[in-house]
C-alpha cells in the first residue's frame, strides 16, 4: 500500500471511531434493563452517563439528567473523564492529521514536517482510541458487578409482610452505547496505527545521519555515504551538487527523499 | 374532542369468533399506544390486550394469548380485537382505552358487549 | 402476575365525610430508574365506562377535583375522598401499570348512608 492510500484510509478510520466515540459518549444507552426475567415490561430503564432514562409502554419517554457531581459514583466520573479526554485528543488528532495528509499540499512544508505530523496525530488517535476502550470497559465491569450483587440480593430472602410481598430489584446489563464505544475506540487506535506506519514510509531514513563530502582527487563531486543507485542521482551525473546539512536533499534534487533503500 | 366508539359486540356460541373495532377521533391515534379492557358481569376489570405505538409489539395476558388478536390500522385510525375460540368466561362489556403516561388509560369508549352462550 | 388487593369492598358514607381507600400489591410498583409508582385509579359511576383519577399513584389527571388525593407508594397506595359530595358515589378501582400483565383490584364501592 503506498504511503498516501495508508495515511489517507487511517485518516478516514480515525475519523469514523471519533465520530463513534462522541455517538457513544452522548448515547443515554449505556446500561439497559434486564429483560431476562421479564421480557415483557410496561416499564424500560436505561441509562447513560449524562442521564438515565424511563419509556413506557404508552410511548412516553421521561429522561432526567445528573445534576449533582458529588453524589454520582467515582467510577462513572472517571469513564466521563476518560471519553472526553478521548474525544478532546480526537479532536487534536484530526486537526493535526488533516494538516499532515501528504495529498493536502499547504505552503512549502516539506514532507518530513508532515510526517513528524503523522505521527503526532496517529499517537493522539492511538491513545484516544485507549481511552475509550478502557472509558467503556471500566464501565461495562461495574455493570457486570452490580448485577452479580443485584442478583444475589435477588435470591436472598424477600422482604415484607413475611415475604409475600416481593420488591423487584432492576439489574443492568450492557447497552448499545457499549458495543458503540468498544468499536469505535478499536477504529480509532487502528486508525491512529496506520497514520504511525504511513509516517515511518513520509520519513526520510537517513535523515537523522549528517552528510559528509568526500574530496576525491581530480574529482570535485560530494558523495553520500550510501550504495551508488540511479535513484540517488550519482554514478552516471558527476555534476557538482551542494550538500545540505543532514543531506535530506541536494539543491537541484526534483525528486523526494530517498527510500529507506538508500543506505547499505 | 377525544372518543372512542366500540362494535361488533353480540350474541356468540362456545367456540365461535368474533371481531371487535374501535374508532377513533379527536387524537393523533398513530402516535398512541391503545388497549382493550372488559368488564365481567361481576363488574370486575380485566385486561385483555395492548398494542404498541407502531404496532410492532403486542400483549395479552395468559387467558387469551393464542385465542385474541389486537391489531389497528392507523390510515383508518381503527383498532381491532379479532376473538377466536370464545368461552363463556369471555362474556363482558368490551372497552377500548388510549393509554398515557405512567401506562394509565386516560379515554375509555362506551363499550361493546360480547355475550358467550350456547 | 402482580394482584391487586382493595379494601374494604364497600363504604357507606354521608355527604361531606372524608373517605380513605386502600389497594396493596403483592409486588413493588415502584420504579427504580424514575422513582415513580406505577399505580392509576379509576372512578366508575353505574352506567358508564371508568374514568382516570390519578396516574403514577399520585399524580392528579386534568379535571379531577382535588378533594381527591392519591398517596403511597411500593406496595400500599390509598385514596383519599375529602369532602364526599353525591356525584362521588361510584365504583372506585386500582391498577397495576407496572408490569403485564396489567391488573385491575375488585374494587371499593362508595354508597350513601
Known amino acids: 500500500m503506498s504511503v498516501t492510500a495508508c495515511q489517507g484510509l487511517g485518516f478516514v478510520v480515525s475519523l469514523i471511531g471519533f465520530a463513534g466515540i462522541i455517538a457513544a459518549t452522548c448515547m443515554d444507552q449505556w446500561s439497559t434493563q434486564d429483560l431476562y426475567n421479564n421480557p415483557v415490561t410496561a416499564v424500560f430503564n436505561y441509562q447513560g452517563l449524562w442521564r438515565s432514562c424511563v419509556r413506557e409502554s404508552s410511548g412516553f419517554t421521561e429522561c432526567r439528567g445528573y445534576f449533582t457531581l458529588l453524589g454520582l459514583p467515582a467510577m462513572l466520573q472517571a469513564v466521563r473523564a476518560l471519553m472526553i479526554v478521548g474525544i478532546v485528543l480526537g479532536v487534536i488528532g484530526i486537526l493535526v492529521s488533516i494538516f499532515a495528509l501528504k495529498c493536502i499540499r499547504i505552503g512549502s512544508m516539506d514532507d518530513s514536517a508532515k510526517a513528524k505530523m503523522t505521527l503526532t496525530s496517529g499517537i493522539l488517535f492511538i491513545i484516544s482510541g485507549i481511552c475509550a476502550i478502557i472509558g467503556v470497559s471500566v464501565f461495562a465491569n461495574m455493570l457486570v458487578t452490580n448485577f452479580w450483587m443485584s442478583t444475589a440480593n435477588m435470591y436472598s430472602g424477600m422482604g415484607g409482610m413475611g415475604g409475600m410481598v416481593q420488591t423487584v430489584q432492576t439489574r443492568y446489563t450492557f447497552g448499545a452505547a457499549l458495543f458503540v464505544g468498544w468499536v469505535a475506540g478499536g477504529l480509532t487506535l487502528i486508525g491512529g496505527v496506520m497514520m504511525c506506519i504511513a509516517c515511518r514510509g513520509l520519513t526520510p531514513d537517513d535523515s537523522n545521519f549528517k552528510a559528509v563530502s568526500y574530496h576525491a582527487s581530480g574529482q570535485n563531486v560530494a558523495y553520500r555515504p550510501g550504495g551508488f543507485k540511479a535513484s540517488t542521482g550519482f554514478g552516471s551525473n558527476t555534476r557538482n551538487k551542494k550538500i545540505y546539512d543532514g543531506g535530506a536533499r541536494t539543491e537541484d534534487d526534483e525528486q523526494s527523499h530517498p527510500t529507506k533503500y538508500d543506505y547499505v | 374532542d377525544v372518543k372512542l366508539v366500540e362494535s361488533g359486540g353480540g350474541l356468540v356460541k362456545p367456540g365461535g369468533s368474533l371481531k371487535l373495532s374501535c374508532a377513533a377521533s379527536?387524537?393523533?391515534?398513530?402516535?398512541?399506544?391503545m388497549s382493550w379492557v372488559r368488564q365481567t358481569p361481576e363488574k370486575r376489570l380485566e385486561w385483555v390486550a395492548t398494542?404498541?405505538?407502531?404496532?410492532?409489539?403486542?400483549y395479552y395476558p395468559d387467558s387469551v394469548k393464542g385465542r385474541f388478536t389486537i391489531s389497528r390500522d392507523n390510515a383508518k385510525n381503527t383498532l381491532y380485537l379479532q376473538m377466536s375460540s370464545l368461552k363463556s368466561e369471555d362474556t363482558a362489556m368490551y372497552y377500548c382505552?388510549?393509554?398515557?403516561?405512567?401506562?394509565?388509560?386516560?379515554?375509555w369508549g362506551q363499550g361493546t358487549s360480547v355475550a358467550v352462550s350456547s | 402476575d402482580i394482584v391487586m388487593t382493595q379494601s374494604p369492598s364497600s363504604l357507606t358514607v354521608t355527604t361531606g365525610e372524608k373517605v380513605t381507600m386502600s389497594c396493596k400489591s403483592s409486588?413493588?410498583?415502584?420504579?427504580?430508574?424514575?422513582?415513580?409508582?406505577?399505580l392509576s385509579w379509576y372512578q366508575q359511576i353505574p352506567g358508564q365506562p371508568p374514568k382516570l383519577l390519578f396516574y403514577?399513584?399520585?399524580t392528579r389527571e386534568s379535571g379531577v377535583p382535588d378533594r381527591f388525593t392519591g398517596s403511597g407508594s411500593g406496595t400500599d397506595f390509598t385514596l383519599t375522598i375529602s369532602n364526599v359530595q353525591a356525584e362521588d358515589l361510584a365504583v372506585y378501582y386500582c391498577?397495576?401499570?407496572?408490569?403485564?400483565?396489567?391488573?385491575f383490584g375488585a374494587g371499593t364501592k362508595l354508597e350513601l348512608r
Open positions: 379527536g387524537f393523533t391515534f398513530s402516535s398512541y399506544t
Open positions: 398494542i404498541i405505538i407502531g404496532g410492532s409489539y403486542t
Open positions: 382505552t388510549r393509554l398515557v403516561k405512567g401506562n394509565a388509560m386516560d379515554y
Open positions: 409486588q413493588s410498583l415502584l420504579n427504580s430508574g424514575n422513582q415513580k409508582n406505577y
Open positions: 391498577q397495576n401499570d407496572y408490569s403485564y400483565p396489567f391488573t
Open positions: 403514577w399513584a399520585s
